[in-house]
Amino acid sequence: GDLLIQKTIKKQVVLEEGTIAFKNWVKTGTEVYRQFWIFDVQNPQEVMMNSSNIQVKQRGPYTYRVRFLAKENVTQDAEDNTVSFLQPNGAIFEPSLSVGTEADNFTVLNLAVAAASHIYQNQFVQMILNSLINKSKSSMFQVRTLRELLWGYRDPFLSLVPYPVTTTVGLFYPYNNTADGVYKVFNGKDNISKVAIIDTYKGKRNLSYWESHCDMINGTDAASFPPFVEKSQVLQFFSSDICRSIYAVFESDVNLKGIPVYRFVLPSKAFASPVENPDNYCFCTEKIISKNCTSYGVLDISKCKEGRPVYISLPHFLYASPDVSEPIDGLNPNEEEHRTYLDIEPITGFTLQFAKRLQVNLLVKPSEKIQVLKNLKRNYIVPILWLNETGTIGDEKANMFRSQVTGKIN
């Protein structure tokens, strides 16, 4: 019986027309939501004038429905047993699942000021930036609506910059009507143990953001894994949101709507400094902010963001070194709320429930030439927001899954 089940599973998890896997892969049957919590800065003037600790108060959730669009340009390649596709982006605001509206205002770091002062480090150019920041009445902090902050706004300072720069700024700009990819993944026809594993991303097998093994595109996109998952496995996956591959390890057995699943979590070791985890040496890209690669829990992805000083972390700087969170007041990290997990049905390798949590931060540094940054006495990695992207298999799908997969095995 086991062999028959194995044979059926192997057949059904192949990514080709007609399989259960393919139908759910092209367009997820699960409702996926992305919740945002914005870090509202309570003391902007004190920070700017006295280099005080930044006092933040999180406000949220503000919820959007995401990943509701079917994959596009799905193309099978029979020669190398791969399927390529684009993953379109779309977000629909869900007022009933939110604490307010997209028009709610927040005091946040001025993204353009922080980014421009980092990108243009030439002292003379910084004096020009200073003039334009002042002329546009911009400052170190700004008040923006949720919609502006996430999806983009025309920045008054950048509009004056006499260089060819994008004048629209937003943490996720551009998002709607864009797509992630092209991804090319193995369809599993010739070797089921490779199904859903990424062969290339944007036509390449590596990212060009990191040195050595850190630059590799490993594993799947985390929506599914090759079947017959073992608890001892380290599950590798690539996340374009954080511009890197990462991994999850088994934590516990979980019962999800009557389906036995394995809960895999991102371990603290994945965020450790090279001192603690030598494998992470190539994620340390500079020596100053990282305090000679001894800081941990934040990832400098500026190379992936056109030089903008974006740092990714877990929410509330969970698993980060004390020096990172020391200049920020109002953070309360806890594993239950702020870690990332994947609940994987081990026979099929399908991720039936997940919570992807991450925080977007921006580095801001003192600048002698820019008046609004002149009084800063230290560097700040400023939290802007954190997000929780979740999906859970629906009741109907769970019933079908139990009857067709786990029920037959048990």
Epitope: Q123, F124, M127, I128, N130, S131, K135, K369, Q371
Partner: antibody, heavy 116, light 107 residues
Framework: QVQLQQPGAELVKPGASVKLSCKAS????????MHWVKQRPGQGLEWIGE????????NYNQKFKGKATLTVDKSSSTAYMQLSSLTSEDSAVYYC?????????WGQGTTLTVSS | DIVLTQSQKFMSTSVGDRVSVTCKAS??????VAWYQQKPGQSPKALIY???YRYSGVPDRFTGSGSGTDFTLTISNVQSEDLAEYFC?????????FGAGTKLELK
Amino acid sequence: QVQLQQPGAELVKPGASVKLSCKASGYTFTSYWMHWVKQRPGQGLEWIGEIDPSDSHANYNQKFKGKATLTVDKSSSTAYMQLSSLTSEDSAVYYCAPIHYGLDNWGQGTTLTVSS
Amino acid sequence: DIVLTQSQKFMSTSVGDRVSVTCKASQNVGTNVAWYQQKPGQSPKALIYSASYRYSGVPDRFTGSGSGTDFTLTISNVQSEDLAEYFCQQYNSYPLTFGAGTKLELK
């Protein structure tokens, strides 16, 4: 528009000091760094230094340290450059120029003549 | 200090000509170079920033090019009002320095 008023000429004796002025109008004086440049007759331009009018923080060309002192008076939107222990080598035209899109607005310059 | 060499102190030209003024830096300055025009008895006027960008209001017959150590200001279709002295300036590092100037005169 940006306007920078500088006295046309100053005549000073060797060994004395002089304080050159540059009165700014047409923009927020404290918002833009002010630069000073020297030009000797028939010669090129030499950068003297810069000052942030918001807090009077100044940076100097090493060559002019001890010779030039930059100050501002925010209330009158005026930048000053004091030159001390004057010699004939200090005879030149001195320009002030605030940084906007670069050094894109220069005063008309003050001709300083050091002569006994 | 970075030295900027404008090898030609004088250049002769005629109205309608195309002329190129050169400037060589003693070390790499990227594209952190500006060009100025100065007429007798007047203060310098900014023409070009970042080696190749024209300031607003500067006629498009003025073109800047170059990066690293070699820079050129080209004036195509020279007009009589272009007869002046031209200075390059680097702002890659302090102190800011200027070239000695190139005087454009009629043949």
